[in-house]
Amino acid sequence: KLLQVSTIAMQQQEKLIQQERALLNFTEWKRSCALQMKYCQAFMQNSLSSAHNSSPCPNNWIQNRESCYYVSEIWSIWHTSQENCLKEGSTLLQIESKEEMDFITGSLRKIKGSYDYWVGLSQDGHSGRWLWQDGSSPSPGLLPAERSQSANQVCGYVKSNSLLSSNCSTWKYFICEKYALRSSV
C-alpha cells in the first residue's frame, strides 16, 4: 500500500512539473506575442502616419518629378555624406540630365546660396574615369569641369551651377536623393 501511495505521489509530482513547464512555455509565448504586437503596432503606426502624410517626399525634402532631394545642413567628408544618405534610405545625388542639374542649382540658389555640395560622383584611382555611385558613367555634359590636383581620392561636388572635383576628405555639405512615393489616388 505504501508503494502504491509513493507511486501516486510521484505521478502527481510529474504532472505538476509538466504543468509548470506548460505554464512557463505559455508565459514565454505570451511575452513573445506581446513583443511582436508592439513591433506590429509600431510598424502600423509608421505606415499609417506615412499614408496620412501621403506626401511623395519626406519633410524637409524637395521634390522634382520622380525624385526627392535632401540638402544637408551639416558638413562632412564624402564617405560620411554617403553613409548619412544611406541612413535616410537614399544615396548621394546622381545627376542624370541637364534639366536635373538646372533644378538642383536653381534650388540651391534659393535655399543657401553659393556653397559646395557633395554628389555621388567619384574618380577611379586607377583608370581616372568618373563614375556615379551605381557604377554608371556621367553623360559628357556632366563631367567635373576641373581636374583636382589631389594625390588622394577625388570626388565630385556641385557649386553654383558647376560640377567640380575635390579631395574626398574635405568637408562640404551634401545632397541625398531617393525616389518620390507614387500617390495611390
Epitope: Y39, E83, L86, K87, E88, S90, T91, D134, Y179
Partner: nanobody, 115 residues
Framework: DVQLVESGGGLVQPGGSLRLSCAAS????????MGWYRQAPGKQRELVAA???????TYADSVKGRFTISRDNSGNTVYLQMNSLRPEDTAVYYC?????????WGQGTLVTVSS
C-alpha cells in the same frame, strides 16, 4: 534591435567568384538601407556596397563592375555577388543595417583570395 547573420565567405582563387548573404531579423522595419563593409588586416573598415530600401545601389570605386549588391523580394536578405576576385579583396566582410538611429553590424565572414 536588428540581428544580422552573414554567410558565404571562404577561400577562392584569384579571378574566382563568391556570393555573400546577409539575413536580417528583428526590428527590420526600421532599416532604411543595408550594406557590406570589409576590413583587411591593419586597415580601416571600408564601405564596399550598399542598397537602399528602394533598391538603389552604391559601390566603392575599387569594386565597380566586379561586385553586384542585390536583395530578395522581402528585403530581409542582402547578397553581394563578387566576381573577378583579386588578392586585395581578402578581408573580413561585415553586413551593416542603416537606420535613422543606431547602426547594426553582423559578426563578419572571412573572404580569402589566394592561389
Amino acid at each position: 534591435d536588428v540581428q544580422l547573420v552573414e554567410s558565404g565567405g571562404g577561400l577562392v582563387q584569384p579571378g574566382g567568384s563568391l556570393r555573400l548573404s546577409c539575413a536580417a531579423s528583428g526590428r527590420i522595419f526600421s532599416v532604411n538601407a543595408m550594406g557590406w563593409y570589409r576590413q583587411a588586416p591593419g586597415k580601416q573598415r571600408e564601405l564596399v556596397a550598399a542598397i537602399t530600401n528602394q533598391g538603389a545601389p552604391t559601390y566603392a570605386d575599387s569594386v565597380k563592375g566586379r561586385f553586384t549588391i542585390s536583395r530578395d523580394n522581402s528585403g530581409n536578405t542582402v547578397y553581394l555577388q563578387m566576381n573577378s576576385l583579386r588578392p586585395e579583396d581578402t578581408a573580413v566582410y561585415y553586413c551593416k543595417a542603416f537606420t535613422r538611429g543606431d547602426d547594426y553590424w553582423g559578426q563578419g565572414t572571412l573572404v580569402t583570395v589566394s592561389s
